[in-house]
């Protein structure tokens, strides 16, 4: 059913999200996950 397959805010389970990369010290990306899954 829809409720079983979708996250409570309506985003499909397993759909990738793409956070903006974080550069707290200017150079390296310190994002926790590059392309985390939404569960």
């Amino acid at each position: 059913s829809y409720s079983m397959e979708h996250f409570r805010w309506g985003k499909p389970v397993g759909k990738k999200r793409r956070p903006v990369k974080v550069y707290p010290n200017g150079a390296e990306d310190e994002s926790a996950e590059a392309f985390p899954l939404e569960f």
């Epitope: 805010w9 990738k16 999200r17 793409r18 903006v20 990369k21 974080v22 550069y23």
Partner: antibody
């Protein structure tokens, strides 16, 4: 590492403008997120979108889709083209390296006849 | 679209005081939240990322907290140099327009 915007100025309503974000001290070849935001006079910050300079993938705020186009034009430059300009587009436009303190000083765009 | 609601719009406190700014997301954003300080005529400066991590070189008087939809920025032992406008921003998802700024909070130091 620094960023600097250029290309701002006075534009007539309905016109098109291309802003350039130039990097110094680093290259876009590594695949950084370069993002654009704007700030109207006396107003808050508004996110426009980001470009992944490695893949060339672009991501826009819903309100910016259609009139705004971001491109990587060289290893040190990214452009933002804005079409069908109106007075509501009058703002200081900033480019930034993802989420960081590396922001350009901004370039002022004034849309007026 | 993710909406970031920031309160208050303006706050005034004396030197040495404490200010707390709140930011509420319209949906969960995990800990993908940044806080910026902006002074007139300058670009924003990143203070905090990942909701609570302090950027290198930023005073420990700035403290971020929260997760999910409710976040706070607390500035303690206020100094005159803290007078600025502060913005929260989520960077949760650039695919689905999840990168919006809060409306800003002007901090006046008396």
């Amino acid at each position: 590492q620094q960023l600097e915007e250029s290309g701002g100025g006075l534009v007539k309503p309905g016109g098109t403008l291309t802003l350039t974000c130039t990097a110094s001290g680093f290259s876009f070849s590594s695949g950084y997120d370069i993002c654009w935001a704007r700030q109207g006079p006396g107003k808050g910050l508004e996110w426009i979108g980001c470009i992944d300079t490695g893949s060339g993938n672009t991501y826009y705020a819903s309100w910016a889709k259609g009139r705004f186009t971001m491109s990587r034009t060289s290893s040190t430059t990214v452009t933002l083209q804005v079409t069908s300009l109106t007075a509501a587009d009058t703002a200081t436009y900033f480019c930034a390296k993802g989420i960081s303190s590396i922001w350009g000083p901004g370039t002022l765009v004034t849309v007026s006849s | 679209d993710i909406v970031m609601t920031q309160t208050p719009a303006s706050v005034s406190e004396p030197v040495g005081g404490t200010v707390t700014i709140k930011c509420q997301a319209s949906q969960t954003i995990s800990s993908d939240l940044a806080w910026y300080q902006q002074k007139p005529g300058q670009p924003p400066k990143l203070l905090i990322y990942a909701a609570s991590k302090l950027t290198s070189g930023v005073s420990s008087r700035f403290k971020g907290g929260g997760t999910g939809t409710q976040f706070t920025l607390t500035i303690s032992d206020l100094e005159c140099a803290d007078a600025a406008t502060y913005y929260c921003q989520t960077y949760y998802d650039i695919i689905d327009d999840g990168c919006t700024f809060g409306g800003g909070t002007e901090v006046v130091v008396k």
